[in-house]
Amino acid sequence: CDLPQTHSLRNRRALILLAQMGRISPFSCLKDRHEFRFPEEEFDGHQFQKTQAISVLHEMIQQTFNLFSTEDSSAAWEQSLLEKFSTELYQQLNDLEACVIQEVGVEETPLMNEDFILAVRKYFQRITLYLMEKKYSPCAWEVVRAEIMRSFSFSTNLKKGLRRKD
């Protein structure tokens, strides 16, 4: 499974699209900053095995895909960029799913990192709650866009796990 290179390329393309999606000046949104508590300490302090890294990355991308696939998201972003971004995420999910099958077999599923997956889910719940509280305002979406870009960058430690042979 030659994931690292293809994943990095797709990840880079997704980040570029996310960077281009901004509609308003972020300078007007400073007061809307929020602490989402991305679980970076948990990730940084853990040596991920390949199957673990794949499933946690999959959860992060799946949650990002879900977040940007809502009606509220469609109203917030320029449609063609949003579609391209969603397509990149969807392709990443397909790549990761193919890799899971190749790495652990169709029957087997990695159960060892439920805590990490739960941490990712709770993180995205905090993001969703923030958007709801801010009534999906343009600035709230700007803050979330910046946060997602940051969390994508933090997933480098997970990608190191993809390069390791179990």
Partner: antibody
């Protein structure tokens, strides 16, 4: 190691132009904004303005709007502060500093060493 | 613009003293306040961000508190290297603004 390295001290005459620089290294330059801060001799800190190097979007303090121009070249991870016509009152130490943008992270956590600009006839 | 007012503008203290510097914003800034230390001829150094978070590498004798309009920087036991000028700065909205500074001198 994160570093912001500023260009050297400048001595200029009133009416001359000047462009000073701030080069970032050890981090993703486009993931952080770069702010500029003035400190006149024996005085406090004054925020001048800020740039998002990812798209060169800028914001200025009303006190400095139209007096200076902030720009960036992301290909060489460098931000700039420039004057088209210097005045004696521009004599000061100028600092650049890194800002996390809309992320919940420390503001101005890394600073350049400062560039002393002296304007005298 | 949001005005930031520090008090006192200067103070004299001895090594081991507990030192408190206050900063008041002209309007509510929630917890969007930073504290910096500056020594002569040096760039400012971030001590506290978001009112109470200690910046990495900063000694635990420094602490920050407050929310809304009133904020405090406390040095629990002043050390020789703490004699410097301290600035508060609001990061709630543009234009970003600094307090006028508090100079901590040796008594």
């Amino acid at each position: 190691e994160v570093q912001l390295v500023q260009s050297g001290a400048e001595v200029k005459k009133p009416g001359e132009s000047l462009k000073i620089s701030c080069k970032g290294s050890g981090y993703s330059f486009t993931s952080y904004w770069i702010g500029w801060v003035r400190q006149m001799p024996g005085k406090g800190l004054e925020w001048m303005g800020i740039i998002d190097p990812s798209d060169s979007d800028t914001a200025y303090s009303p006190s400095f709007q139209g007096q200076v121009t902030i720009s960036a070249d992301k290909s060489i991870s460098t931000a700039y502060l420039q004057w088209s016509s210097l005045k004696a009152s521009d004599t000061a130490m100028y600092y650049c500093a890194r800002h996390p943008g809309l992320n919940w992270a420390p503001d101005f956590d890394y600073w350049g060493q400062g560039t002393l600009v002296t304007v005298s006839s | 613009d949001i005005q930031m007012t520090q008090s006192p503008s200067s103070l004299s203290a001895s090594v081991g003293d507990r030192v408190t510097i206050t900063c008041r914003a002209s309007q509510s800034i929630d917890g969007s306040l930073n504290w910096y230390q500056q020594k002569p001829g040096k760039a400012p150094k971030l001590l506290i961000y978001f009112a109470s978070s200690l910046q990495s590498g900063v000694p635990s004798r420094f602490s920050g508190s407050g929310s809304g309009t009133d904020f405090t920087l406390t040095i629990s036991s002043l050390q020789p290297e703490d004699f410097a000028t301290y600035y508060c700065q609001q990061s709630y909205d543009f234009p970003l603004t600094f307090g006028q500074g508090t100079k901590v001198e040796i008594k």
